[in-house]
């Protein structure tokens, strides 16, 4: 059965300067390959977080993604600014050269409220 990417919240609201959690769970880790978070869609989408060795300021994983059975790929964005508003997608890739996108969550829209 094909892996499914579940983003339970359609939208979240957060006050500027606060933190927010964007939830994402997978139904399987197979096929092997990375999971990445993007804001927006298409060619202009912006990489927000990758569950590899890269480090992203203000964005951290919520659960221990080094667990071999981990299916929780939620992230926390800290010190949110108005520029962080947009729709965030949790995306599963199959390994390759380059990696191939095989499934995306439905997206979570982040609304940033004035402090």
């Amino acid at each position: 059965t094909e892996v499914k990417v579940i983003q339970p919240e359609k939208s979240v609201s957060v006050a500027a300067g606060d933190s927010t959690v964007l939830n994402c769970t997978l139904t399987s880790l197979l096929p092997v390959g990375p999971i990445r978070w993007y804001r927006g869609v298409g060619q202009s989408r912006q990489l927000i977080y990758s569950f590899t060795t890269e480090h992203f300021p203000r964005v951290t994983n919520v659960s221990d993604a080094t667990k071999r059975s981990n299916l929780d790929f939620s992230i926390r964005i800290s010190n949110v600014t108005p520029e962080d508003a947009g729709t965030y997608y949790c995306v599963k890739f199959q390994r390759g050269s380059p990696d191939t996108e095989i499934q995306s969550g439905g997206g979570t829209e982040v609304y940033v409220l004035a402090k």
């Epitope: 197979l30 096929p31 590899t52 060795t53 221990d64 993604a65 080094t66």
Partner: antibody, heavy 118, light 107 residues
Framework: DLQLVESGGGVVRPGESLRLSCAAS????????MSWVRQAPGKGLEWLAG????????YYIDSVKGRFTISRDNSKNSLYLQMNSLTAEDTAVYYC???????????WGLGTLVTVSS | ALTQPASVSANPGETVKIICSGG??????YGWYQQKSPGSAPVTVI????KRPSDIPSRFSGSASGSAATLTITGVRVEDEAVYFC???????????FGAGTTLTVL
């Protein structure tokens, strides 16, 4: 500079126990899963056990399950391997290794030699 | 089990390919580990199929397809003489395995 330094090896008799340590430095130890790998004399590499970054999840090869226990103390930047009921077949150089995000290995320690002999 | 040739040899400057088979592309990632003498610390030359650590020369490259992974050394040097172990992580079983090792001799 990233460093992994094993210690605790030595000569023990069959049936005895030994605890190996691996001191990590030069990286954020608490962010990485870790593993123990051994190499018997004249043989290849054999993965033994792995542990998640937080220490809550552990994984073992069948042949050491129940005898060996992997653990870690992130406050001390240290990884451990408790080995019980040792036999001559456990004679090997034991390496600790840092895991990549997909559970392969990117850095290795220099190893510590364990000899089990009567 | 991972299968790799027991030995390969090459002249300096030649290209060497070492193939490791036995994994499942759907669930397995591969790495390659260099050991210059028995009991010395292994050095990772490739992980995640094709990722080269920053301190490894660019003549080392890796690829994976189907049930096999390949380590390629382009323009092999005398200092590349070593035993090369392929390793794999299986996302189905959560287990790591290694091949028996390939001894590279540079003539």
């Amino acid at each position: 500079d990233l460093q992994l330094v094993e210690s605790g090896g030595g000569v023990v008799r069959p049936g005895e126990s030994l605890r190996l340590s691996c001191a990590a430095s030069g990286f954020t130890f608490s962010s990485y899963a870790m593993s123990w790998v051994r190499q018997a004399p004249g043989k290849g590499l054999e993965w033994l056990a792995g542990i998640s970054a937080g220490g809550s999840d552990t994984y073992y090869i069948d042949s050491v399950k129940g005898r060996f226990t992997i653990s870690r103390d992130n406050s001390k930047n240290s990884l451990y391997l408790q080995m019980n009921s040792l036999t001559a077949e456990d004679t090997a150089v034991y390496y600790c290794a840092r895991e990549t995000w997909n559970h392969l290995f990117d850095y290795w320690g220099l190893g510590t030699l364990v000899t089990v002999s009567s | 089990a991972l299968t790799q040739p027991a030995s390969v040899s090459a002249n300096p400057g030649e290209t060497v390919k070492i193939i490791c088979s036995g994994g499942d592309y759907y669930s397995t990632y591969y790495g390659w580990y260099q050991q210059k003498s028995p009991g010395s610390a292994p050095v990772t030359v490739i992980h995640s199929d094709d990722k080269r650590p920053s301190d490894i020369p660019s003549r080392f490259s890796g690829s994976a397809s189907g049930s096999a992974a390949t380590l390629t050394i382009t323009g092999v040097r005398v200092e590349d003489e070593a035993v090369y172990f392929c390793g794999a992580y299986d996302g189905r079983t959560y287990i790591n395995t290694f091949g028996a090792g390939t001894t590279l001799t540079v003539l």
